[in-house]
């Protein structure tokens, strides 16, 4: 059974992940982002089901295309901290949260999503899990 300290750690990690995803979304939605139109043409795959931490496997598998879009976006008016580091940090958190005991084959929905829809989906996921922990 999860201890209060492990629950707290999970909560903090989820909050960190949530902040990273929100930071990316805010940067993309910035009206000064000159590459927004181009960024919105990228296809992202959405999980059929995302209700448990193990479903973060589906986010992990989409981090490479996410990095690619963010590299495209970098400009004077849209600047995230080093994209590689940001994606790497997200990856570390995701790996810790989902655990490595069971390897999940991620099931994706038939429809694709834009980067904005993709980020909103995972932001909602984080918020939902955090609310169950508190």
């Amino acid at each position: 059974a999860p201890t209060s300290s492990s629950t707290k750690k999970t909560q903090l990690q989820l909050e960190h992940l949530l902040l990273d995803l929100q930071m990316i979304l805010n940067g993309i939605n910035n009206y000064k982002n000159p590459k927004l139109t181009r960024m919105l043409t990228f296809k992202f795959y959405m999980p059929k089901k995302a209700t448990e931490l193990r479903h973060l496997q589906c986010l992990e598998e989409e981090l490479k295309p996410l990095e690619e879009v963010l590299n495209l976006a970098q400009s004077k008016s849209f600047h995230l901290r080093d994209t590689k580091d940001l994606i790497s940090n997200i990856n570390v958190i995701v790996l810790e949260l989902k655990g490595s005991e069971t390897t999940l084959m991620c099931e994706y929905a038939d429809e694709t999503a834009t980067i904005v829809e993709f980020l909103n989906r995972w932001i909602t996921f984080c918020q939902s899990i955090i609310s169950t922990l508190t």
Partner: antibody
């Protein structure tokens, strides 16, 4: 090896229908946009449209919108170009090509099929 | 649609010559430009992407430069196997239009 293999040459009569194919191998077919390009005899290259095999999302050039239909069957890694009623002016070489970056169509085409010759004559 | 123009439409040069082809876009396309080589009876082959990046496996005698509306493609030392038609293509806006092509042959 990343490859696109197209179906063989076709000779058809005006008014007939036709579907030519483009089969991808050596890469994740669903993750890259596939474009189609027409080359009429002795002429240059004309961009027709693109399809994303994962969800069959399509974009057409206004010049070809309503003239042809793009489709894909991701289970067999194959994209298709279809005409419901051919005209003599459809006589050309047709190429399929993969968009280099994957996930977005805003990249050039890096891998090309060998082309399919379509001849329409009465 | 963005119109692409190329010049010259054809050229003849000697082996070892430096060959230059220009491509002009009807509006700003940033660096979203490819150069393709098409040999007679063959499919086009990508040589240069993003205006100046050499595709893997393409000889270094081929190069590209330019941005916005004016682009240049160069063969530093023409070889017999370079006989082909060269096309530029923009991918800034749909539809992704091609230039009319430049036919290169040997004197």
């Amino acid at each position: 090896e990343v490859q696109l293999v197209q179906s063989g040459a076709e000779v058809k009569k005006p008014g007939e229908s036709l579907k030519i194919s483009c089969k991808g191998s050596g890469y994740s077919f669903t993750d890259y946009w596939i474009g189609w390009v027409r080359q009429m005899p002795g002429k240059g290259l004309e961009w027709m449209g693109i399809i994303y095999p994962y969800d069959s999302d399509t974009r057409y050039s206004p010049s070809f919108q309503g003239q042809v239909t793009l489709s894909a069957d991701k289970s067999i890694s194959t994209a298709y170009l279809r005409w419901s009623s051919l005209k003599a002016s459809d006589t050309a070489m047709y190429y399929c090509a993969r968009h280099r970056g994957g996930r977005s169509y805003y990249y050039g085409m890096d891998v090309w099929g060998q082309g399919t010759t379509v001849t329409v004559s009465s | 649609d963005i119109q692409m123009t190329q010049s010259p439409s054809s050229l003849s040069a000697s082996v070892g010559d430096r060959v230059t082809i220009t491509c002009q876009a009807s509006q700003d396309i940033s660096n979203y430009l490819n150069w393709y080589q098409q040999k007679p009876g063959k499919a086009p082959k990508l040589l240069i992407y993003d205006a100046s990046n050499l595709e893997t496996g393409v000889p270094s005698r081929f190069s590209g430069s330019g941005s916005e509306t004016d682009f240049t493609f160069t063969i530093s030392s023409l070889q017999p196997e370079d006989i082909a038609t060269y096309y530029c293509q923009q991918y800034e806006n749909l539809p992704f239009t091609f230039g009319p092509g430049t036919k290169v042959d040997i004197k």
